[in-house]
């Protein structure tokens, strides 16, 4: 798409991990769980131990973008959340280490993190009009908005 090719020459350099072991809950208070190995989905949990714990790494853009650009990794793994296309599930991509530099087609690993009060939004850098979203009876995917849920609460320090 046009936005993707426009951004593809921007280089993103890894800075540091800024959050460890947090849980993402959607607006229906469903937690993200790992389903069937490479997929994520949302479910109302009795036991929060079933919720995925994420780490968040920050990247700095060569374009000096004001937006906070992040990568999402499942804690204690080498699995990174990877965007596909609109309404397609996000996938878990295994990489030996966190990428030091990301550019071009690899920007599907990156998200712009925006906060509005307690609401958190993750926009795909590769598809800037699409958000990480939950959808009833479906996987965590990329979506532009309703009926998918695009706002998340970050739960930290869950024992």
């Amino acid at each position: 798409s046009a936005p993707f090719s426009f951004l593809s020459n921007v280089k993103y350099n890894f800075m540091r991990i800024i959050k460890y072991e947090f849980i993402l809950n959607d607006a229906l208070n469903q937690s993200i769980i790992r389903a069937n190995d490479q997929y994520l989905t949302a479910a109302a949990l009795h036991n929060l131990d079933e919720a995925v714990k994420f780490d968040m790494g920050a990247y700095k853009s060569s374009k000096d973008d004001a937006k906070i650009t992040v990568i999402l990794r499942i804690s204690k793994t080498q699995l990174y959340v990877t965007a596909q296309d609109e309404d397609q599930p996000v996938l878990l991509k295994e990489m030996p280490e966190i990428p030091k530099t990301i550019t071009g087609s690899e920007t599907n690993l990156l998200f712009f993190w925006e906060t509005h009060g307690t609401k958190n939004y993750f926009t795909s850098v590769a598809h800037p009009n699409l958000f990480i979203a939950t959808k009833q009876d479906y996987w965590v995917c990329l979506a532009g908005g309703p009926p998918s849920i695009t706002d998340f609460q970050i739960l930290e320090n869950q024992a």
Partner: antibody, heavy 122, light 107 residues
Amino acid sequence: EIQLVQSGAEVKKPGASVKVSCKASGYTFTNYGMNWVRQAPGQDLERMAWINTYTGESTYADDFKGRFTFTLDTSTSTAYMELSSLRSEDTAVYFCARGIYYYGSSYAMDYWGQGTTVTVSS
Amino acid sequence: DIQMTQSPSSLSASVGDRVTITCRASQDISNCLNWYQQKPGKTPKLLIYYTSRLHSGVPSRFSGSGSGTDYTFTISSLQPEDIATYFCQQGKTLPYAFGQGTKLEIK
């Protein structure tokens, strides 16, 4: 209540085939992978294969490639294991077990079927 | 593949005893260690996941600990109904191997 209910015991002759079913209830079938585990008489647990219940893709442990086939019927939340060209050494209890990731990083098998005994004898 | 070595292979203890079983992984498994109980002629049951978390409905006399490559399963006060074989299993990387099992008997 989460339950995995397997089909009943089977007695087969060498060279025959057997198909074991595992019907799941009490949870969203496609959200959790399914495992098949073998326990031969007096032996330890061996994880034979695991199935992505969304895509139907099976991943086999090295010792179980060839004569084993694992299938799904998502409309009835049922997993199947088929074993062809049966041999006496296939005599064992076969379990299905739901796979779950704790924290997204640690895999366990939290609910198990009651087991299906397959006896191969001439 | 990660290998799991469980010890002892069998043990005999009296009712009320504290019982300990160990499991060693061939490499660091980051606390991704589960324990299962299998009573004679029955299906395995998940007792403990992620080193120390009790699965729902499991009595508190069962516990787990450890880190890195070395893990321990403990029954604080052995009960007659605890007669079973206990298996560890690593949940870090495929193929998520089981240990060889420890058969627990009452003296």
